[in-house]
Amino acid sequence: QHTCSISKVTSLLEVNCENKKLTALPADLPADTGILHLGENQLGTFSTASLVHFTHLTYLYLDRCELTSLQTNGKLIKLENLDLSHNNLKSLPSLGWALPALTTLDVSFNKLGSLSPGVLDGLSQLQELYLQNNDLKSLPPGLLLPTTKLKKLNLANNKLRELPSGLLDGLEDLDTLYLQRNWLRTIPKGFFGTLLLPFVFLHANSWYCDCEILYFRHWLQENANNVYLWKQGVDVKDTTPNVASVRCANLDNAPVYSYPGKGCPTSSGDTDYDDYDDIPDVPATRTEVKFSTNTKVHTTHWSLLAAAPSTSQDSQMISLPPTHKPTKKQSTFIHTQSPGFTTLPETMESNPTFYSLKLNTVLIPSPTTLEPTSTQATPEPNIQPMLTTSTLTTPEHSTTPVPTTTILTTPEHSTIPVPTTAILTTPKPSTIPVPTTATLTTLEPSTTPVPTTATLTTPEPSTTLVPTTATLTTPEHSTTPVPTTATLTTPEHSTTPVPTTATLTTPEPSTTLTNLVSTISPVLTTTLTTPESTPIETILEQFFTTELTLLPTLESTTTIIPEQNSFLNLPEVALVSSDTSESSPFLNSDFCCFLP
């Protein structure tokens, strides 16, 4: 019998020589070994030349072998996975020539103090790189340029003080980045580029909050659903986002994402997420929705109320800079949750920050009746382009929204997913979309209606129109928005049923009617009639804190007026605060948020 145990896994011969007190490679290894476990032995040094004749070798485990030296002087043409973790390596040789097929490299828990610039040259297939728990103080520029297929990068628990600005350039497939527990003070401007990173870990660093942190702050705000707190032994998919875990070391551990940046330059060069003003508007022809995978659901109820609109039109406006326009493809993750609730980022226990979010839909009165039917509402002829194409273009500085028609769809069986970002485009004519959001349009202060059409659809019989994306008001006249994704639903016992599917059409200026066409499950038989005399203003309002504390519903309204109709990626947004609410700190534009 062999020294090592032999089995087969997925057609590969697996040889397990773990913990056999070996000081060298066993002499009787099978020639067709595909998976070789040599961990927990006392090998000291290792040379790939000793394995060149094992032409099937695909996985090689050399963890906990007391390695102080690795020589790559023999080519292992099929090796895909190399585990060198928990050794005493102080340096790494160049690996590309010897291991051209490598997809996973684990050199975690070693004593690497630095990496040579070309150490990863030739590793064009590398998908996972684990370098956590070493003594890395810096990284060479261009380190990852050869590894364009990288999906997971772990640099946690090192001594990194800074990151090369172009470290992530070209890593279009990167989905997980671990940078926690380093000595990082800031993130270089443009570091993340246009990457959409579903899972990022950034806590336990020495983040220094001054004007240099504004790029990073803005990125955190834009990616709040993708920043997590790492926990030992817990799969990232089983945790909730925790953007508040990223804290200012110099400001009493206040969250970086809420750093006010008082006194910092407000020019686009300092605060822009990236220079997106140069990017032309492009007609969209397809709908793509990106979702975060959060499986622990933190819930909060949303209030739905009807109130008379404010008579005052006096407003204060805050101009906000463009938000991130993603260009990169990303996998779709389905996030399921119970209707009536929404997922919010999990946060630390201290430093509550309050935000208010309101969404107004003003229905101009008409004696329209909502009739429950069992068939899909047929769009008006003028709405037909919705199902074919949607061109989202508008003059840059226009203050009047251009008429647009947009639909955002979600996967068929999703129960109100929470998108992190979305590219608004339209589905093919053959598909019946189930949109969870719609273009927000409001009346100008002059009350002139803007001809805009939006379709709102909620999955399952529901009592609420469900827009799922909105922009939060930000602290202290901050020039950067705090974006969120929000699923708006009503509490179970709401007394005002809202149609499951409704087409809201704001008429041409010459018309004074708003038509509501509804498709309601046969179970819902309530008829909702819009009174002729009084306009109805439906307010969907949310208040939450980083501690998920619920606050009472307030009656004032904040209106969101897009200046360019590119919904979800609003290049510029004005937040209007009605001055009838000056008594409420939540709604006063001078004091929108409680900060720690």
Partner: antibody, heavy 118, light 113 residues
Framework: EVQLVESGGGLVQPGGSLRLSCAAS????????MSWVRQAPGKGLEWVSS???????YYPDSVLGRFTISRDNSKNTLYLQMNSLRAEDTAVYYC????????????WGQGTLVTVSS | DIQMTQSPSSLSASVGDRVTITCKSS????????????LAWYQQKPGKAPKLLIY???TRESGVPSRFSGSGSGTDFTLTISSLQPEDFATYYC?????????FGQGTKVEIK
């Protein structure tokens, strides 16, 4: 046409030994992994051992240390040396050919009966 | 070891019937490297050796009639005979070829009603 013909079965006392053979034809024997699978009377199928084309043997725990699989590529023959036989080893033993490096069995012999009884 | 559980253990059916046999594994048989599920199905008639029908969950062995089909992923698998023929009355076994020791289900005997 692929053919696998087992031989060597018979009655043996507990603790005894037996050597089974499987003569292969109709394919390039040296290029394929080969296996032994058994079936106790009225029962289901149970894998006994395999040997890769390079000659590497592997076994389930139930026979490890008692059974030895081997092959002679020059004779196109597969062997199973069974020692320390037990009553529960009583079964029809099938020789089976694997498909390439995969481990499903695309051809089977007709089987040979091994009875372990005192 | 991976345990394989077949159901039902036996069933009675008539010629022309659609027959479905299920097989569950105690752990996933999906190989993430190639997205293949390592499951095979065999047919065995009394006094005869088993015959390979399907491998990698759904790939029909050469010469096997198209009325035999396999499906499933992860831990749940199905063998379907779309229209039972007289020669199909036999015992059917599933086998995982994901990791050794290779293990079989206990078998499903398809009898004439």
């Amino acid at each position: 046409e692929v053919q696998l013909v087992e031989s060597g079965g018979g009655l043996v006392q507990p603790g005894g030994s037996l050597r089974l053979s499987c003569a292969a034809s109709g394919f390039t024997f040296s290029s394929f992994a080969m296996s032994w699978v058994r079936q106790a009377p009225g029962k289901g199928l149970e894998w006994v051992s395999s040997i890769t084309s390079a000659g590497t043997p592997y076994y389930p725990d139930s026979v490890l240390g008692r059974f030895t699989i081997s092959r002679d590529n020059s004779k196109n023959t597969l062997y199973l040396q069974m020692n320390s036989l037990r009553a529960e080893d009583t079964a029809v033993y099938y020789c089976a050919k694997s498909r390439g490096y995969e481990d499903y069995f695309d051809y089977w012999g007709q089987g040979t009966l091994v009875t372990v009884s005192s | 070891d991976i345990q394989m559980t077949q159901s039902p253990s036996s069933l009675s059916a008539s010629v022309g019937d659609r027959v479905t046999i299920t097989c569950k594994s105690s752990q996933s048989l999906l190989n993430s490297r190639n997205q293949k599920n390592y499951l095979a199905w065999y047919q065995q008639k009394p006094g005869k050796a088993p015959k390979l029908l399907i491998y990698f969950t759904s790939t029909r062995e050469s010469g096997v009639p198209s009325r035999f089909s396999g499906s499933g992923s992860g831990t749940d698998f199905t063998l379907t005979i779309s229209s039972l023929q007289p020669e199909d009355f036999a015992t059917y076994y599933c086998q995982q070829h994901y990791s050794s020791p290779w293990t079989f289900g206990q078998g499903t005997k398809v009898e004439i009603k």
